[in-house]
């Protein structure tokens, strides 16, 4: 399960991005004097940084553009979907159930006739 631990963080980072994008889109047409879009852009950059950290296989010092980060995220999501689509391992059987009829079957009854050889 540890291998999938980044998923929650990744999900939050993606939500973070989408919320910020939505806020910027809604903010268009407002007075350019408001400082909100600038702080939102800072937040988006923070979200991209979080995403870059969460996607496996990206060396720490690597510089990636926002498009490259998103592409890596998409690839990672697709990989996770493939893993989740595979059937999960299952048990060999259910718990042992006793037979309710307690009759001894003829072939398992101990023979009283102990001959020294069998025909």
């Amino acid at each position: 399960m540890k291998a999938l631990s980044p998923v929650r963080g990744c999900y939050e980072a993606v939500c973070c991005l989408s919320e910020r994008s939505l806020a910027i889109a809604r903010g268009r047409g407002k007075s350019p004097s408001t400082e909100e879009p600038l702080s939102l852009l800072d937040d988006m950059n923070h979200c991209y940084s979080r995403l870059r950290e969460l996607v496996p296989g990206v060396p720490r010092g690597t510089q990636l553009s926002q498009v490259e980060i998103l592409q890596r995220v998409i690839d990672y999501i697709l990989d996770l979907q493939v893993v989740l689509a595979e059937p999960a391992p299952g048990p060999p059987d259910g718990p042992h159930l006793p037979i309710q009829t307690a009759e001894l079957t003829p072939e398992l009854v101990i023979s009283k006739d102990k001959r020294s050889f069998c025909h």
């Epitope: 059937p87 391992p89 299952g90 048990p91 060999p92 059987d93 259910g94 042992h96 309710q100």
Partner: antibody, heavy 111, light 111 residues
């Protein structure tokens, strides 16, 4: 408590065939049912099961050609396709725990 | 997984003891998910032992199962004429397929 297989007959290669396992004295809804086969003079071969939650699992060799499904609270089907002469065998169903087996039904695949 | 049993036939004298081994290529589920069956010609298999060492209801205590992981043994003591049969082991595995695998069978001949 017992199970009984039915539907076995002589078929030609390529003919699909469905076998039925019918339970008496208990319900199949909350138990696993296994299908096992035995070619004449050969050993036992596990085909697959359907679980209490209706999940079917198969032996690797049976995947794709064999389908196990619950059709009612007392019957489970084994659907077989693309039959070959190698599939000639007595087919058994067994209840969870493998302590209740049917007498078997003979499937003969021949030209 | 592959289950390898003691080659057939195995001879036993009335009143004697006979042991049949069953080796799995990988550990069975829970290290104990192994059953033993007795089968006579024209009959379905009969469960003797489940979960390595548990005796099925109605089975004489002369039948004893032991082992763990990949190596298992069925021991029949005070052998009777009626014990002449083919014995199969069945391993259970927690996997996506091949959840149950039978051994090739061991014929026991009683003299």
């Amino acid at each position: 408590q017992s199970v009984e297989e039915s539907g076995g007959r002589l078929v030609t290669p390529g003919t699909p065939l469905t076998l039925t396992c019918t339970a008496s004295g208990f319900s199949l809804s909350n138990v696993y049912i296994h299908w096992v086969r035995q070619a004449p003079g050969k050993g036992l071969e596990w085909i697959g099961y359907i679980s209490d939650g209706d999940t079917a699992r198969y032996a690797t060799w049976a995947k794709g050609r064999f389908t196990i499904s619950k059709t009612s609270s007392t019957t489970v089907n084994l659907k077989m396709t693309s039959l070959t002469t190698e599939d000639t065998a007595t087919y058994f169903c067994a209840r969870q725990g493998f302590n209740i087996w049917g007498p078997g039904t003979l499937v003969t695949v021949s030209l | 997984a592959v289950l390898t049993q003691t080659p057939s036939p195995v001879s036993a004298a009335v009143g004697g003891t006979v042991s049949i081994s069953c080796q799995s290529s990988q550990s069975v589920w829970n290290n104990n998910w192994l059953s033993w069956f007795q089968q006579k010609p024209g009959q379905p298999p009969k469960l003797l032992i489940y979960e390595t060492s548990k005796l099925e209801s109605g089975v004489p205590s002369r039948f004893k199962g032991s082992g763990s992981g990949t190596q298992f043994t069925l021991t029949i003591s005070d052998v009777q004429c009626d014990d002449a049969a083919t014995y199969y082991c069945l391993g259970g595995y927690w996997t996506t397929s091949d959840n149950n695998v039978f051994g090739g069978g061991t014929e026991v001949v009683v003299k």
